[in-house]
Interface confidence: low
């Protein structure tokens, strides 16, 4: 007898690698047998020529190549989104709408976040060298590799975390030239060579002249950000020194810094930067947002004078360089619910205070922006009406709100209720893949606060916003 | 792999200005690294000229320090000489370098552009 | 500043060994040193780091054959089994900072020939 249809095989989120093609599964039931039609962000696919798409006769869509994409909004070189695929089965009895299946293409970018120093340790230290890999999508895993060799993470010896290279204790056979590699499924990465030289505890019975030199750390300065290093440059400052005393001059000096712990603290360890500098040097590798402590260490072959008086720095907060990551928009019951992720720590540039969260206008909430306090991710938005959604969120700092999200849309097509008892149906797409409808929401919200924590009431119909805890 | 590549003329009057490129790829001029002047007189003896390290500070040879400057363009990832006033004595190959790890220690050099100084 | 002094010229035979010395003024005694090889219109290479310990730390690419090491002021770059393809200008070079004037000095080099 005659049944409407219903999806038995959904179509599944997937990586387009490669040459490709991909391809995108949906069966159905139904008598009589439904036809397949498949949708990219809500809209049908032509498949007429030049259109890279597909349909199989068993209702597998083929995608041969990538289609085009949007501008990333986030600083990335690429958008790794391709879309949602959606797809519908219909007979004369109904339509049955599968789940949506994203898309999206492996990226890696060509520079690391974090590139490794050259370090110089004495044996029996604790040695780090840090890298950040670059951005890329699948997330890249890192090795590190010793003088053109992969280095055999041997337990209690070497320790990866978060892309950083943890030496436990450095012995001589630790120096060399260290490479970090970041690797996805869209290729390989290597960090610059990092020189790691390992001496011998300090010997006070060899002629260390160095010794009778005394140094001065007079200032440490802030600098002004250099505009050729691009929008968001970190901080850098300028150490200056004076060097008295009988001995030889110093061959080589190198600052160490750490970041001030709370008084009773144990100090964090210094990290330790060979200066290009004989009375004054340029020092980065910091944060904004924290305080630090500085010293400067001259030093001579194995011989290391004694090290300079500390001064300490506070750097001021900034507003987030990046956007939260992962920002979606999913129906709740009566509500649209948005969560998200924060930025990258690299990029907080200080204490993340909170979130600001933009409605855009001509959707079915009118322009609105709330204020999400501490460390929520989540923020709930009660409203029953039809219609396309679409947000932006901020991180926000003492400095104020960073750059927004990319904006991300949920299309309701039908009243609230119906949502709520079937959310898989509708997933969230980019506003790029609404742009005929939304064009004017490119412009995007303006980011000036006057306060940065002055919750914004905004009432209309019967919508309210609540705040929900993220655990 | 890094590699730096010399540009400029080969031939300049005595009392005029020496100017050169070095243009740098494979590695960001502003992620890392002294960009070095290095030139090579007719003798084959070698002196360093001075650097721009990456963040924008420079040093000069102190012999040099009246009349070199040594400036930058990040966003093309090129370094610049120039030598003021010069005469036949700073006829020379002139070689673009940067160290890989020690500060004064340059694995990595330019093929050389030879400058001669004559009217 | 320092002052690097070199030989003129060496020569040694093929398969042979060598031992190239720069000396640095006694003012400058424990200083580190780096060793460079150069062929006929090519650039100088960076073959490696002594330090006034004698520890070396060879560039990428170098033979076994190259060594370093250090005595008192001299620094010697000790080359073994000697290859046609060693025959080059070796120049060794020292970075200084003398009364907050920093800077590179270069010896004058030393002709090396294979017989």
């Known amino acids: 007898q005659d049944s409407p249809p219903q999806i038995l095989v959904h179509p599944q989120d997937q990586l387009f690698q490669g040459p490709g093609p991909a391809r995108m599964s949906c069966r159905a039931s139904g008598q009589p047998p439904p036809t397949i039609r498949w949708l990219l962000n809500g809209q049908p696919l032509s498949m007429v020529p030049p259109d890279p798409h597909h349909l199989l006769p068993d209702g597998t869509l083929l995608l041969l190549q990538p289609p085009a994409r949007g501008h990333a909004h986030d600083g990335q070189a690429l958008s790794t989104d391709l879309g949602v695929y959606t797809c519908e089965a219909s007979n004369r009895l109904g339509t049955a709408v599968s789940r949506g299946a994203r898309l999206s293409v492996a990226v890696l970018r060509e520079d690391f976040q974090i590139q490794p120093r050259d370090m110089v340790a004495v044996v029996g230290e604790q040695l780090t060298l840090e890298c950040g890999p670059p951005w890329g999508h699948p997330e890249p895993t890192v090795s590190w590799w010793k003088d053109g060799k992969p280095l055999v993470l041997q337990p209690g010896r070497y320790t990866v975390s978060g892309g950083s290279l943890l030496m436990a204790r450095a012995e001589k056979s630790d120096a060399g030239a260290y490479m970090c590699v970041a690797a996805n499924s869209a290729g390989h990465r290597e960090s610059r060579a990092a020189r790691v030289s390992i001496q011998e505890p300090q010997d006070y019975t060899e002629p260390v002249e160095l010794l009778a030199v005394r140094i001065q750390l007079e200032n440490v300065t802030l600098l002004n950000p250099d505009p050729a290093k691009g929008p968001k440059p970190g901080p850098a400052v300028w150490l200056s020194w004076k060097v008295s005393g009988p001995a030889a001059p110093a061959q080589s000096y190198t600052a160490l810094f750490r970041t001030q712990t709370a008084p009773g603290d144990q100090g964090a360890p210094w990290t330790e930067e060979l200066l290009a500098g004989w009375q004054s040097a340029e020092l980065g590798g910091l944060h904004w947002g924290q305080d630090y402590e500085f010293k400067v260490r001259p030093s001579s072959g194995r011989a290391r004078g004694p090290d300079s008086n500390v001064l300490l720095l506070r750097l001021p907060e900034k507003v987030p360089s990046a956007p939260p990551q992962e920002v979606t928009l999913k129906p709740g019951n009566g509500s649209v619910l948005v969560s998200w992720v924060p930025p990258s720590a690299e990029n907080h540039n200080g204490t993340i205070r909170g979130y600001q969260v933009w409605s855009l206008g001509n959707t079915s909430l009118p322009p609105a922006n709330w204020t999400v306090v501490g460390e929520q991710t989540q923020l709930e938005i009660a409203t029953r009406m039809p219609g396309s959604y679409c947000v932006q969120v901020a991180a926000v700092t003492g400095a104020g709100a960073g750059e927004p999200s990319s904006p991300v849309c949920l299309l309701l097509e039908q009243a609230m209720e119906r949502a709520t008892r079937e959310p898989s149906e509708h997933g969230p797409w980019t506003l790029e893949q609404l742009r005929v409808d939304l064009e004017v929401l490119f412009q995007g919200p303006g980011s000036g606060l006057n306060d940065i924590f002055e919750a914004q009431k905004i009432e209309w119909h019967e919508a309210r916003a609540h705040h929900h805890h993220h655990h | 792999q890094i590699q730096l590549q010399e540009s400029g003329p080969g031939l300049v009057k005595p009392s005029q200005s020496l100017s050169l490129t070095c243009s740098v790829t494979?590695?960001?001029?502003?992620?890392?690294?002294?960009w070095t002047w290095i030139r090579q007189f007719p003798g084959n003896n070698l002196e360093w000229m001075g650097y721009?390290?990456?963040?924008?500070?420079?040093d000069y040879n102190p012999s040099l320090t009246s009349r070199i400057s040594i400036t930058r363009d990040t966003s093309r990832n090129q370094f610049f000489l120039q030598l003021e006033s010069v005469t036949t004595q700073d006829t020379a190959t002139y070689y673009c370098?940067?160290?890989?790890?020690?500060?004064?220690?340059?694995?990595?050099w330019g093929q050389g552009t030879m400058v001669t100084v004559s009217s | 500043q320092p002052v690097l002094t070199q030989s003129p010229s060496a020569s040694a035979s093929l398969g042979a060994s060598v031992k190239l010395t720069c000396t640095l003024n006694s003012q400058f005694s424990t200083y580190n040193i780096g060793w460079y090889q150069q062929h006929r219109d090519k650039p100088p290479k960076y073959v490696m780091f002594v330090k006034g310990d004698g520890g070396h730390s060879k560039a990428d690419g170098i033979p076994d054959r190259f060594s370093g090491s250090s005595s008192g002021a001299d620094r010697y770059l000790t080359i073994s089994n000697i290859q046609a393809e060693d025959e080059a200008i070796y120049f060794c070079?020292?970075?200084?900072?003398?009364?907050?004037?920093?800077?590179?000095?270069f010896g004058s080099g030393t002709h090396f020939t294979v017989l």
């Open positions: 721009i390290s990456y963040a924008g500070g420079i």
């Open positions: 070079g020292a970075d200084y900072n003398n009364a907050g004037q920093y800077g590179c000095v």
């Open positions: 494979g590695y960001s001029i502003s992620s890392g690294s002294l």
């Open positions: 370098a940067t160290p890989g790890g020690y500060p004064f220690h340059f694995d990595y």
